[in-house]
């Protein structure tokens, strides 16, 4: 399903063969945090990959001496602000003492702000993107990804953390939002809906897509996730919408074909390394960008969100596999794992291309209500 204006060259138009496998923002592993309770220390828990809470699980940045070279991420609870009544609300619950946020769920009590006060912040994510109101910012150059092509060995950890499926990424995946804005990829996770119900986190003019992939990155200015949480630009997430297309997406199939092995909450498996960039759209030049937060507790703000204009196409069967295979807490299906959209509260979404220009013949002249605020750094 596309919005009326989503033609090949219009905002969010044209799915690519590049695939996205977004992992939720729920658990951001910290670099030095102690291992999760679900991850008892063992030979595989070598120094250098600790878990931090965040978007799904943010992996640690220090290289592990561990076999697969994968980083361990700690689950951060995601808390969500109230959204429209039809949408699932993200409320986290704690069944541990203290500030532990690694156990929370979508919907239910307590409200996320009680789990993490930041979830009630003014600049939260996700948001509804209105291309006509986006500020065209020519300083936003094409994204640069380096080292995202991984050989099959070492293998990577694919985990059902109870609120998403998350792939922990090894050291060396470098991403630049622009000059001097350099990041390292930590993990990726997905958000999805249920049968006949879309489950992307971001929306476009109110339109929700079937699913969404998030690739979570840590700024090279920080050694650990916990140091970056809440700092402007400390974390950056690349997000792409997943749509239904006629063909199977081979890149995503490498992950989706393994979901049955991790159907149970807390289970994990090892998957061969792959081209991580193939999970993303092929067009790195057209995107929307704004400053928001993690979409799961602790909902830390200062996160730079980059939402691709181009979508990624998966087959109907693949989308069904994604939404109908995993189980979450309390013997419930892991579905509708998205947070309701949050108010912009004065924020302006920037676009790397003139998204406000309607490409259809009906557009008399471009409508661009906001101007670019960024200087490009």
């Amino acid at each position: 399903q596309r919005l009326p204006r989503m033609q090949e060259d219009s905002p969010l138009g044209g799915g690519s063969s590049g695939e996205d496998d977004p992992l939720g923002e729920e658990d951001l592993p910290s670099e030095e945090d102690s291992p999760r309770e679900e991850d008892p220390p063992g030979e595989e828990d070598l120094p250098g990959e600790e878990d931090l809470p965040g978007e799904e699980d943010l992996p640690e940045v220090k290289p592990k001496s561990e076999e697969e070279g994968s980083l361990k991420l700690e689950d951060l609870p995601t808390v969500e602000a109230p959204g429209d009544p039809q949408e699932p609300q993200n409320n986290a619950h704690r069944d541990k003492e203290g500030d532990d946020q690694s156990h929370w769920r979508y919907g239910g009590d307590p409200p996320w702000p009680r789990v993490s006060p930041a979830c009630a912040g003014r600049f939260q994510s996700p948001v509804d993107i209105r291309p006509q109101l986006a500020a065209f910012c020519p300083a936003l150059r094409p994204l640069e990804l380096l080292g995202f092509q991984l050989p099959p060995l070492p293998e990577l950890r694919l985990r059902n953390n109870g609120h998403s499926v998350q792939l922990t990424l090894p050291p060396g995946l470098e991403m630049a939002l622009g000059p001097g804005r350099e990041y390292r990829a930590l993990q990726l996770h997905l958000h999805w809906g249920a049968a006949g119900r879309p489950g992307s986190e971001h929306t476009v003019e109110g339109h929700r897509f079937p699913a969404e992939i998030h690739v979570v990155h840590l700024s090279t200015a920080f050694a650990r996730v916990d140091e970056a949480l809440g700092r402007p630009g400390g974390l950056a997430v690349l997000a792409a919408f997943l749509e239904e297309g006629p063909e199977e997406n081979s890149a995503y199939e490498q992950l989706l074909s393994r979901l049955e092995e991790i159907a149970e909450e807390g289970s994990e498996t090892q998957v061969p390394g792959l081209d991580i960039s193939a999970l993303l759209p092929s067009d790195f030049s057209r995107y929307f960008q704004y400053e928001g937060s993690l979409t799961t507790p602790p909902c830390a703000q200062g996160v730079i969100w980059t939402v691709f204009n181009q979508t990624v196409m998966l087959s109907a069967k693949q989308l069904h596999t994604l939404s109908d295979t995993l189980w979450g807490p309390g013997d419930s299906r892991l579905q509708l794992n998205f947070r309701a959209t949050q108010p912009l509260n004065g924020r302006v979404i920037e676009a790397s291309f003139p998204a406000g220009v309607d490409s259809s013949p009906r557009a008399a002249e471009p409508v661009q209500l906001n101007s670019c605020l960024a200087a490009g750094d």
């Epitope: 030979e43 595989e44 070598l46 290289p63 592990k64 001496s65 561990e66 076999e67 697969e68 070279g69 380096l146 080292g147 995202f148 092509q149 991984l150 050989p151 099959p152 060995l153 070492p154 293998e155 090894p170 050291p171 060396g172 090892q270 061969p272 390394g273 081209d275 960039s277």
Partner: antibody, heavy 119, light 111 residues
Framework: QVQLVQSGGGVVQPGGSLRLSCAAS????????MSWVRQAPGKGLEWVSA????????YYADSVKGRFTISRDNSKNTLYLQMNSLRAEDTAVYYC????????????WGQGTMVTVSS | QSVLTQPPSVSGAPGQRITISCTGS?????????VHWYQQLPGTAPKLLIY???NRPSGVPDRFSGSKSGTSASLAITGLQAEDETDYFC???????????FGGGTKVTVL
Amino acid sequence: QVQLVQSGGGVVQPGGSLRLSCAASGFPFSSYAMSWVRQAPGKGLEWVSAISANGGTTYYADSVKGRFTISRDNSKNTLYLQMNSLRAEDTAVYYCANNGNYRGAFDIWGQGTMVTVSS
Amino acid sequence: QSVLTQPPSVSGAPGQRITISCTGSRSNIGADYDVHWYQQLPGTAPKLLIYANNNRPSGVPDRFSGSKSGTSASLAITGLQAEDETDYFCQSYDSSLSAWVFGGGTKVTVL
């Protein structure tokens, strides 16, 4: 001390079989992918086979596919290479190597064992 | 013939800087796969010298550095020393072959 100690080399006739072993110590063997790499006399390095940390996935060079089998016993911290239908061109020093770290680099190597296929 | 191409030999005087090239294709180095470099002393196993294009394992002198661009990579040795006279190999992964691949090796001679 991190090390890989190899054994099992020797002289074998064409068509014969040989099994190489590689005993690991000083690191969590069961957490690492492993490979076999060979070097013919006076020649360069050639990757032969690889196996994932849990042994569930194996990979082979076209030159040995169907003849060689890589396996591991994580309870014994040992890697194996079963070589069947050996040919003269398989003559080489065989190294076991850890390729579970550094994004696919081989960071720990065994001392090597010579395999000579000759009639 | 090796998938990755290296010059058979490179020489330099003590203290000089030399570079060893490693040329691949769009299915290995050009596909954004990492390049790793090994040093092999006579009669011994190879030793990892540079991993992931430009990273040195602990214990490797900073005289050794790596770089990668397009379908090629290179190893630089500055302040060449007598003990650097040995063989060097580059390595990557090739998606077309589904195999880890090596260069043919380069013999470094210190004049």
